[in-house]
């Protein structure tokens, strides 16, 4: 079927970066400036995305791939393919409808984006707070009481997967 289709449809021979031009007897024509086709057999080329205003160009448009945008400093991407730019706040703040607001007491945000989250409640696990939380970071809980008993082993357990830089950086 594929072979038959290609015999019947000359457009299937048009590679990425071209389109099948009905106005020119279905020959493969290069995509015009500021347009692209990322797959073969296209009957039109797509208009390149333009990174304007708060968006800036991360990757230029080519005849075979669309431009990619990111956000100017002070903003970060949201949505698939960076469809929106949202204002950064400082660590210890969150973005509200009225702008950046400090985290309420008992909450923290260690990033320039996202919302303030509650400090960990160490006492839920029977642990104490060794270092208080701040607006910018969570508390440090003590170890479990079992770790501190006279018979406790000092052997280091195997490391779980830790996020790079959680803020252990």
């Amino acid at each position: 079927f594929e072979r038959t289709r290609s015999l019947q449809d000359p457009c299937s021979n048009c590679p990425a970066g071209t389109f099948c031009d009905n106005n020119r007897n279905q020959i493969c024509s290069p995509c015009p400036p500021n347009s692209f086709s990322s797959a073969g057999g296209q009957r039109t080329c797509d208009i390149c995305r333009q990174c304007k205003g708060v968006f800036r160009t991360r990757k230029e448009c080519s005849s075979t791939s669309n431009a990619e945008c990111d956000c100017t400093p002070g903003f970060h991407c949201l949505g698939a393919g960076c469809s929106m730019c949202e204002q950064d706040c400082k660590q210890g703040q969150e973005l509200t409808k009225k702008g950046c607001k400090d985290c309420c007491f008992g909450t923290f945000n260690d990033q320039k984006r996202g919302i303030c989250r509650p400090w960990t409640n160490c006492s839920l696990d029977g642990k104490s707070v060794l270092v208080n939380g701040t607006k910018e970071r969570d508390v440090v809980c003590g170890p479990s009481p079992a770790d501190l008993s006279p018979g406790a082993s000092s052997v280091t357990p195997p490391a779980p997967a830790r996020e790079p830089g959680h803020s252990p950086q």
Epitope: W119, D125, V131, G133, C141, D147
Partner: nanobody, 114 residues
Framework: QVQLQESGGGLVQAGGSLRLSCAAS?????MGWWRQAPGKQREFVAI???????NLADSVKGRFTISSDNAKNTWFLQMNSLKPEDTAVYYC???????????WGQGTQVTVSS
């Protein structure tokens, strides 16, 4: 596997000083020191966070200081005016903000003679 290695323990006379070091194979946000005397529970000595916040047990305040070299994943316990009751095995610990997981070194013996 995370490795923590203490060094600097030893025998010292009362009133003397020692400096303990702990080197970690990874990066952590909360680095501490604990001690355990024979037959007793392991007790908190000092802790420092990556941003420099510190907390020391009341029994060592004014005598011990904790510091760190974040770039080298190493932290230190400077112990001055040592007393016989400071005799114990000293363990370094590593954890993260909000984490219930602790990593421990193997311990280094500190003995203070009178």
């Amino acid at each position: 596997q995370v490795q923590l290695q203490e060094s600097g323990g030893g025998l010292v006379q009362a009133g003397g000083s020692l400096r303990l070091s702990c080197a970690a194979s990874g990066s952590f946000n909360a680095m501490g020191w604990w001690r355990q005397a024979p037959g007793k529970q392991r007790e908190f000595v000092a802790i420092i966070t990556r941003d420099g916040s510190t907390n020391l047990a009341d029994s060592v305040k004014g005598r011990f200081t904790i510091s760190s070299d974040n770039a080298k994943n190493t932290w230190f316990l400077q112990m001055n005016s040592l007393k016989p009751e400071d005799t114990a095995v000293y363990y370094c610990s590593a954890s993260d903000y909000g984490s219930s997981l602790y990593y421990w070194g193997q311990g280094t013996q500190v003995t203070v003679s009178s």
